[in-house]
Amino acid sequence: AFGISGVQKYTRALHDSSITGISPITEYLASLSTYNDQSITFALEDESYEIYVEDLKKDEKKDKVLLSYYESQHPSNESGDGVDGKMLMVTLSPTKDFWLHANNKEHSVELHKCEKPLPDQAFFVLHNMHSNCVSFECKTDPGVFIGVKDNHLALIKVDSSENLCTENILFKLSET
């Protein structure tokens, strides 16, 4: 397990001033767990990082992820509402220079080392779809969310808004 040492939630200096031309409105260091309270953990194996969904032993330290929140304007011609809207997007970084990426071809979630500006595959639209849980929708593939499949993170297609509360795409953020 690894994390970002010495970083206080919300109060760290924003790393890099600009990502795709915009700065994060806030950053948040948190552990990520599933709706069923399994932890999302990260491990270095054979020079690449693996992502796991697992039950932690009692008192085992949870891995932290730096969530950077960005405000994105959504033009009315895309929204279908006739009005411009705003949405929150996030990037998730469990360790320096590595970000979660959506691999839409493989329907997988991967950790990639990359430089700024980050590619669109590293951005996820944030949803509050259930009390105090969040979901992460691929910026590059609307309707596709980070989810849990076979104890790993995967990309899961959600067919209708009624399925947005399905447990395998719901995550909890915690400072502990």
Partner: antibody, heavy 121, light 107 residues
Framework: QVQLQESGPGLVKPSETLSLTCTVS????????VHWIRQPPGKGLEWIGV???????GYNSALMSRVTISKDTSKSQVSLKLSSVTAADTAVYYC???????????????WGQGTLVTVSS | DIQMTQSPSSVSASVGDRVTITCLAS??????LAWYQQKPGKSPKLLIY???RLADGVPSRFSGSGSGTDFTLTISSLQPEDFATYYC?????????FGQGTKVEIK
């Protein structure tokens, strides 16, 4: 443009159910959450609950046993029902829309004008 | 539930004064705090969201600061139209609780 309009009876008898409707226009209920907030005369704001874009609901803990929020997407309406009302439920009731698509983190940017509901026999 | 405590409950000030209102959350809420202005008989108006971001159309004399549990709304130079009641609200977790309000009155 974005509009929210509350409607319903201005007078409800004690022990009955208060029913209000918020009719919205200029945005989609599948993209934005709609909240109900109330304000007793001369007092502060109290959050009642939310109908989220995905269809799930969240409620004020103190009111949870009495409150139901639902929607009729075809009519662009969000309904509030509050059962077993007492004089303490007398208030101006507002509906309001989330600032962000899909998320309540940004607060409520659009509000209805509010409707006064008096609970009295 | 997260409790939001605003102070002061009222403040008397003159046009041109700098006014500061604070809001304290009972647990950490990150940056997920909004400030509203309400005038008698009117609906609340969003001033600040995400603790520091100015809502569209809000004059730049309004500013927000803070994160975690301690937040501040500042009016740098009070104008006649700013006499109103101000509320903070946490949006980190449901139920989305409000502070009790701060009334800004004419001295």
């Amino acid at each position: 443009q974005v509009q929210l309009q509350e409607s319903g009876p201005g007078l409800v008898k004690p022990s009955e159910t208060l029913s209000l409707t918020c009719t919205v226009s200029g945005f989609s209920l599948s993209k934005y959450g709609v909240h109900w907030i109330r304000q007793p005369p001369g007092k502060g704001l109290e959050w009642i609950g939310v109908l989220r874009a995905g269809g799930s609901t969240g409620y004020n803990s103190a009111l949870m046993s009495r409150v139901t929020i639902s929607k009729d997407t075809s009519k662009s309406q969000v309904s509030l029902k509050l059962s077993s009302v007492t004089a303490a439920d007398t208030a101006v009731y507002y509906c309001a829309r989330d600032h962000y698509y899909y998320s309540s983190y940004g607060g409520f940017v659009y509000w209805g004008q509010g409707t006064l509901v008096t609970v009295s026999s | 539930d997260i409790q939001m405590t605003q102070s002061p409950s009222s403040v008397s000030a003159s046009v041109g004064d700098r006014v500061t209102i604070t809001c304290l959350a009972s647990q950490t809420i990150g940056a997920w705090l909004a400030w509203y202005q309400q005038k008698p008989g009117k609906s609340p108006k969003l001033l600040i969201y995400a603790a520091t971001r100015l809502a569209d159309g809000v004059p730049s004399r309004f500013s927000g600061s803070g994160s975690g549990t301690d937040f501040t709304l500042t009016i740098s130079s009070l104008q006649p139209e700013d006499f109103a009641t101000y509320y903070c609200q946490q949006l980190d977790s449901s139920p989305y609780t409000f502070g009790q309000g701060t009334k800004v009155e004419i001295k």
